[in-house]
């Protein structure tokens, strides 16, 4: 006889990344007919919702409206059928972002190079942190962590085209409490070792695409946005 | 104390070449860069060369008519410049392991103080 109903997911949108004083929606999707749904946050319960009918609604969506570090952490969900219960969901870590001030990203040595070239990015940031984070923009991001006084070096080691990209840094408070985004740089790799050159690129990222790309586990696992319950375990754990 | 200095610079007509020197002391670094200035626009990267592994790489606006080496025994670091047009005239710098900083901003602890290539028509 089963015991426990299998976990449900849990992600947020539109990121987990949130900027503070921005909404942010933290979503929990069971199985249809599940009477009940808990958020907890840091192990303790924090909100409920009853879904109507539930027969018909597999998910159901907790509202913040103005995102500050007392609300950022590590949250999961459980829901109910009847009386039976789920396993709870993975962990998801909801980080504040924009908090205090902005690291200045730099890239050993240029941005545009050769593939076999040592690349190396450097974060940097005077206020009182000494962890960073280098990230890179797209669905399947990879992150790094990285520590020092005021400055992180982030060795990529010989680069090959899939270091291709756009990347960012934050400096780190804690876990859950991120600077505002450095910069943007565009790091721009050439396959052939022969074609030593590159037209000139201004490094564009548009604000509105910040929050539209995903990290991916450990595990490398890649999901459709709507089933994300991973959220970057790798790197805040 | 580290230094870079520059030497080389000077007046030639168009098609002409020069070569520029930057004397590196102090101690060893990973890559020295050329980047050149021209009145009233922003420092553009022209050539950077790895100290060890020699690989080199250009700007789009210089390859194929300048060349970047350097020889290890004297610590020196050269920019052959060949085809000279008027829109290379600018102060050159070389500078140790500079990086790139977003919107076309470079950053180094070293700089040289340049040296002044002007390519008359």
């Known amino acids: 006889q089963q015991q426990t109903l299998p976990k449900p997911f849990i992600w947020a949108e539109p990121h987990f990344m949130v900027p503070k004083e921005k909404q942010v929606t933290i979503c929990c999707q069971g199985n249809y007919g599940a009477v009940e749904y808990q958020l907890h946050f840091e192990g303790s319960l924090f909100a409920v919702d009853r879904p109507k009918p539930p027969e018909r609604i597999n998910k159901v969506q907790f509202y913040i409206p103005d995102m500050n570090s007392r609300m950022a952490g590590q949250y999961s969900c459980i829901y109910r059928v009847g009386e039976l219960w789920s396993e709870p969901s993975n962990l998801l870590d909801l980080v504040v972002t924009e908090m205090y001030d902005t690291p200045t990203l730099s890239v050993h040595p240029g941005p545009e190079v050769i593939s076999g070239e040592k690349v190396t990015f450097y974060c940097r940031l005077d206020t009182a942190t000494s962890m960073f984070l280098l990230l890179k923009e797209g669905r399947s991001s990879h992150v790094q962590r990285g520590y020092g006084k005021v400055q992180a070096e982030f060795p990529l080691g010989p680069v090959t085209t899939a270091h291709r990209g756009t990347y960012r840094c934050f400096g780190s408070y804690n876990n859950h409490a991120w600077s505002f985004p450095s910069e943007p740089v565009k790091l721009l790799v050439t396959g052939d070792i022969e074609n030593t050159s590159l037209a000139p690129e201004d490094p564009t990222f548009p604000a509105d695409t910040w929050g539209t790309y995903l990290l991916t586990t450990e595990t490398g696992l890649q999901k459709d946005h709507a089933l994300w319950d991973h959220t970057a375990q790798n790197l805040l754990r | 104390d580290v230094q870079l200095v520059e030497s080389g610079g000077g007046l030639v007509q168009a098609g002409g070449s020069l070569r520029l020197s930057c004397a590196a002391s102090g101690r060893t670094f990973n890559t020295i860069h050329w980047f050149r200035q021209a009145p009233g626009k922003e420092r553009e990267f022209v050539a950077r060369?790895?100290?060890?592994?020699?690989?080199?790489f250009y700007a789009a606006s210089v390859k194929g008519r300048f060349t970047i080496s350097r020889d290890n025994a004297k610590n020196m670091v050269y920019l052959q410049m060949n085809s000279l047009k008027p829109e290379d005239t600018a102060v050159y710098y070389c500078a140790a392991d500079a990086r790139y900083t977003g919107s076309r901003r470079w950053e180094s602890d070293y700089w040289g103080q340049g040296t002044q290539v002007t390519v008359s028509s």
């Open positions: 060369i790895w100290w060890i592994e020699r690989t080199t």
